[in-house]
Amino acid sequence: ALDTNYCFRNLEENCCVRPLYIDFRQDLGWKWVHEPKGYYANFCSGPCPYLRSADTTHSTVLGLYNTLNPEASASPCCVPQDLEPLTILYYVGRTPKVEQLSNMVVKSCKCS
Amino acid sequence: ALDTNYCFRNLEENCCVRPLYIDFRQDLGWKWVHEPKGYYANFCSGPCPYLRSADTTHSTVLGLYNTLNPEASASPCCVPQDLEPLTILYYVGRTPKVEQLSNMVVKSCKCS
């Protein structure tokens, strides 16, 4: 699986999850998030050669098409597969609130 | 929606579904498919500027991150959203078989 366990341990050029730390205030302009100050959102990148973690029949077909037609511009792309939520603390005035934000952290990637 | 209705009618540079005809024999080397000879598989391509058909909170956050950090290499990618099946006819010996292959045709795209 093209997940953090594999990708963060290997120098993988092809489609894999990459570490990306986002600081809420500096990178997004979000002053309203109290904790954490930032988090590892991660992202997916790298080429999708034929059959690399293909998501659907279409991406498999497209990968094969590219292999046999190297000049083609149509190719699968490396995108998030598994995402996890992030729990944040923010304040409504003086009142603390805890919220779980869905689909905030990329854990693995696929070729789609 | 970044679907064939919209994308095939507009000269859209950003993420959109593009027409791609695949000839089973010539492009894939599949001699076993009798009918059709080929089909419009289509594909997704084009930049994913901030908030263009963002798929998840992560892709929205990543888009915002890119807007505020233009030098960043992490950005959402244009990939298939809705896929449709394709019905094919092939022969097992002299016996015709009809099969529906799932997820063969891209109908719309998203930024993921």
Partner: antibody, heavy 120, light 108 residues
């Protein structure tokens, strides 16, 4: 230059519905919490509710809870106020505002306002 | 909800004079959850002071805010003709956000 421009105000009958829009420009729309504030003719200011960007967490004043919905289209840099089951006492100028940064905060930019009149 | 009471309701002064506007909260707001706005007829409110004492960008130095707990003050050191308007205080310590009923500053 930051600008907020409201539209959609109208004369509507009690129990009717209306949707107000607020187009923002001059800043990164998805970085700030946005609020609606209203002002009845000749009266003071009343907070209506807020929405947090991207995650779309919203909260409302008791007077409008269950009837009004705040949403935003980040791609269009637009804030909306959907008003249902309107009452005569909802008659006011409605202002779209940007907060300084926190969820509850001072409001550093205001639109010009749009008038909603609820009358039979 | 937190009730804000502004006084006086109307303040009649002449240009050049010092204006002192009061805002009292029904419960303590701490030291930094109060803002002041100015509103002229037919216009939207304009933020003057936030965090009880911080001036918003572009606000002249003659405007100053002070106070903590339940008692807050907006002071205009020397009134200019364009300062005559209605002034509102706003608390954002607790939900819902509330505003005072306003103080009308008029030319004497």
């Amino acid at each position: 230059e930051v600008q907020l421009v409201e539209s959609g105000g109208d004369l509507v009958k009690p129990a009717g519905s209306l949707r107000l829009s607020c187009v923002a420009s001059g800043y990164t729309f998805s970085s700030n919490v946005m609020s609606w504030v209203r002002q009845a003719p000749g009266k003071g200011l009343q907070w209506v509710g807020y929405v947090i960007p991207i995650v779309d967490i919203a909260n409302y004043a008791d007077a409008v809870k269950g009837r009004f919905t705040i949403s935003r289209d980040n791609a269009k840099n637009t804030l909306y106020l959907q008003m249902n089951s309107l009452r005569v006492e909802d008659t006011a100028v409605y202002y779209c505002t940007r907060t300084l940064g926190l969820v509850l905060d001072a409001m550093d930019y205001w639109g010009q306002g749009t008038l909603v009149t609820v009358s039979s | 909800e937190t009730v804000l009471t502004q006084s006086p309701g109307t303040l009649s002064l002449s240009p050049g004079e010092r204006a002192t506007l009061s805002c009292r909260a029904s419960q303590s707001l701490g030291s930094s959850y109060l803002a002041w706005y100015q509103q002229k007829p037919g216009q939207a409110p304009r933020l003057l002071i936030y965090g009880a004492s911080s001036r918003a960008p572009g606000v002249p130095a003659r405007f100053s805010g002070s106070g903590s707990g339940t008692d807050f003050t907006l002071t205009i050191s020397s009134l200019e003709p364009e300062d005559f308007a209605v002034y509102y205080c706003q608390q954002y310590a607790d939900s819902p956000i509330t505003f005072g009923q306003g103080t009308k500053l008029e030319i004497k």
